[in-house]
């Protein structure tokens, strides 16, 4: 009878030990299985979870616009006063709803190439007005022409055309015209076949971004989604030195197993450069733990503050010999037009940039860019891309519309907030397929280990207690 009990206790302890060992073994083995599954599923090829979402994003992406309505156009043009602006918005469009096209796998170098079609659908219910709302903004063609043609002879010619077309420094345009294009009356007088349509995002609809060629991760998962080339080149030809490199992914996803210490590098064709984000905080997104990566102020710093940025300073006059910061001259990428990109309301920009503009209120929470990345898969499940489009306008002696200006202005035209968040359904699916399974496996591992250890300790204590009792 005593033997039976002792044997039972030993058996219980052994079972507990086995469970604990099994739980312990399941930890690295399970992690290995998870890693293997993740590695298999994040590869960009037909049949994987990643590929399906990559071809056509499951996230609804909105682009909100706020237009800077100029309140004192005549005063600025006549007296070179500070420009008083008032932001109006949001005006919301649905974007990135079109699937990638011309998808071609190259098994040789483990890449996949594609183009991303552009399209924008106005969402009246998410907007403060209609596409026909009017705004007073800088005259894009009048501001750009003397910048492109710095030749004094041609400026006299252009002045004749500007006067004839009754154009001036500022103009009134509808939202639709300003964003997507309008026939400019001054450019229409140029007697050569030039493009006379002007718009901040013209041309956009029915155009494509790319060709992108990215690594599919089949041979090396740590390279998945990283851009190998853009428009057939490994460099942009916009910047000197390493600033011209195409680094990282397109920010829609990153190689899996993201660590907080990692700097996420990505390329954005909107700003014609590669940039980076650093870990900010851990947040819970619809029950999924994600890492929030933010664009640091350092990325927009002057070469004085961040020497790595020296090659993004391509002109010395407007940048006050590269001491100004927070604005990026992307003219080389925009056919020589004087386009400057910044964060909204000149967030993280030097005081000299915003000084000539009244009515700006930079705010870190509203105006910063962030990416919420699920660390196991590397998928970006939520993001907010915020940027501002500005045009440089300079005094031009030969152009009457600009001759009274006493200083150059970097004039804010609009700022945008492009956001995407994983849908509730998709989030549930993601939890079930990824985080749920990992949680479940973790729970099973812990349960086995816990139950096993408890059983082993309890049965061993009971066995020892019995043994000492019997001994007495």
């Amino acid at each position: 009878m005593g033997c039976d009990r002792n044997c039972g206790l030993i058996a219980g302890a052994v079972i507990g030990a086995v469970l604990a060992v099994f739980g312990g073994i399941l930890m690295p083995v399970g992690d290995m299985l998870i890693e293997k599954t993740i590695k298999r599923e994040v590869v960009l090829e037909e049949g994987t979870t990643a590929f399906k979402n990559w071809v056509k994003t499951g996230t609804t992406v909105y682009r909100q616009f706020w237009i800077f309505d100029v309140q004192n156009p005549d005063d600025v043009a006549k007296n070179s006063s500070k420009i008083k602006v008032k932001q109006r918005g949001p005006y919301t469009y649905r974007v990135r709803y079109l699937a990638k096209e011309n998808i071609t796998q190259d098994p040789e170098d483990h890449t996949v190439s594609f183009v991303q079609p552009n399209g924008a659908i106005f969402e009246p219910s998410l907007s403060v007005g209609t596409e026909d709302d009017n705004f007073t903004v800088l005259n894009l063609a009048v501001a750009a022409a003397p910048h492109i043609y710095q030749n004094s002879f041609v400026q006299v010619v252009l002045n004749s055309l500007i006067k004839k077309s009754k154009s001036s420094m500022f103009q009134t345009r509808s939202l639709k015209e300003l964003l997507w294009g309008y026939k400019d009356p001054f450019l229409s007088l140029v007697p050569y076949p030039i493009s006379t349509t002007v718009g901040v995002f013209y041309p956009y609809n029915d155009t494509v971004d790319g060709v992108y060629k990215v690594f599919n991760g089949k041979d090396n998962i740590s390279k998945v989604a990283i851009i190998e080339s853009y428009k057939g080149k490994r460099n942009l030809s916009y910047w000197p030195s390493y600033c011209d490199m195409i680094n990282g992914t397109d920010a829609a996803s990153f190689p899996p197993f993201v660590e907080k210490s990692r700097t996420l590098r990505f390329f954005s064709s909107d700003i014609c450069r590669s940039i980076y984000a650093v870990f900010g905080s851990e947040i819970d997104l619809k029950g999924i733990p994600v890492y929030r990566f933010v664009l640091p102020a350092n990325a927009f710093a002057s070469p004085l503050q961040n020497p790595d940025n020296h090659c993004f300073c391509t002109e010395k006059v407007i940048s006050n010999n590269c001491t100004s910061y927070g604005v990026l001259d992307i003219g080389k990428c925009k056919e020589g037009k004087p386009v400057y990109i910044s964060l909204p309301h000149f967030l993280h920009a030097s005081p000299d940039v915003s000084e000539p503009i009244e009515g700006l209120h930079p705010n870190e929470d509203e105006h910063r860019t962030y990416l919420d990345v699920e660390p196991i898969t590397g998928f970006t499940l939520q993001f907010a891309k915020r940027l501002q489009v500005n045009i440089l306008v300079k005094p031009a002696r030969k152009i009457e519309a600009l001759k009274n200006l006493k200083r150059p202005y970097i004039v804010p035209i609009l700022w945008l907030n492009e956001t995407g968040t994983i849908g509730d359904e998709k989030a549930e699916m993601f939890k079930t397929q990824v985080t749920g399974k990992i949680k479940l496996l973790g729970m099973v591992e812990m349960a086995l280990l816990g139950i096993g250890v408890v059983m082993f300790v309890a049965f061993m204590i009971s066995y020892c207690a019995c043994k000492s009792k019997n001994g007495k």
Epitope: N151, V156, S160, L189
Partner: antibody
Framework: EVQLVESGGGLVQPGGSLRLSCAAS????????IHWVRQAPGKGLEWVAW????????YYADSVKGRFTISADTSKNTAYLQMNSLRAEDTAVYYC??????????WGQGTLVTVSS | DIQMTQSPSSLSASVGDRVTITCRAS??????VAWYQQKPGKAPKLLIS???SLYSGVPSRFSGSGSGTDFTLTISSLQPEDFATYYC?????????FGQGTKVEIK
């Protein structure tokens, strides 16, 4: 087809006046602007005057300022060069030429102006 | 005013030769330079604008180079019809100014 035809040249006495015409076809002169360029016998080319597109502005070489006037009649698609107080050194072949960005893509055949007593 | 100095003022060459004519501006004119060919008794003809841009219908043996203050017109292989006088012109600032010309003669 773009064509420019000058007329009005001839022999004139020093101190005299002459009006040169430049009839354009194949394009509208107001859209481009018209220049007058002259070439003294055996010498190089010298820019004389310019009327900017849409009659925007007129420009003259220092050597003719105050004596020559450039004008255009858009209804006739013709440019003119009114030359007063002519001097012997104004003797040259006068060409009218079309330009927008400052280079001359079309030229007339030229008309000879001789200033001599 | 911007002075345009052409050199040489004349040169003798044979058919098939490579000919180079230079032009120097008295100040920076960026790439706003044009080149013309003129034959006796005729109006000048545009060859090149913006220092390097070949005008339509002009044979590809003509090419232009340079930026800032120094410019060059090159005829890669001289043809019989190329014997003429060549002028450079700046179209950067009014008054527009020409070089004094380079006469290309048969050797």
């Amino acid at each position: 087809e773009v064509q420019l035809v000058e007329s009005g040249g001839g022999l004139v006495q020093p101190g005299g006046s002459l009006r040169l015409s430049c009839a354009a076809s194949g394009f509208t002169i107001s859209s481009f602007g018209i220049h007058w360029v002259r070439q003294a016998p055996g010498k190089g080319l010298e820019w004389v005057a310019w009327i900017a597109p849409y009659g925007g502005e007129e420009y003259y070489a220092d050597s003719v300022k105050g004596r020559f006037t450039i004008s255009a009649d858009t209804s006739k698609n013709t440019a003119y060069l009114q030359m007063n107080s002519l001097r012997a050194e104004d003797t040259a072949v006068y060409y009218c030429a079309r330009s927008f960005f400052g280079y001359f893509d079309y030229w007339g055949q030229g008309t000879l102006v001789t200033v001599s007593s | 005013d911007i002075q345009m100095t052409q050199s040489p003022s004349s040169l003798s060459a044979s058919v098939g030769d490579r000919v180079t004519i230079t032009c120097r501006a008295s100040q920076d004119v960026s790439n706003w330079v044009a080149w013309y060919q003129q034959k006796p008794g005729k109006a000048p003809k545009l060859l090149i604008s913006y220092a390097t841009s070949l005008y339509s219908g002009v044979p590809s043996r003509f090419s232009g180079s340079g930026s800032g203050t120094d410019f060059t017109l090159t005829i890669s292989s001289l043809q019989p019809e190329d014997f003429a006088t060549y002028y450079c012109q700046q179209h950067s600032n009014a008054p527009l100014t020409f070089g004094q010309g380079t006469k290309v003669e048969i050797k």
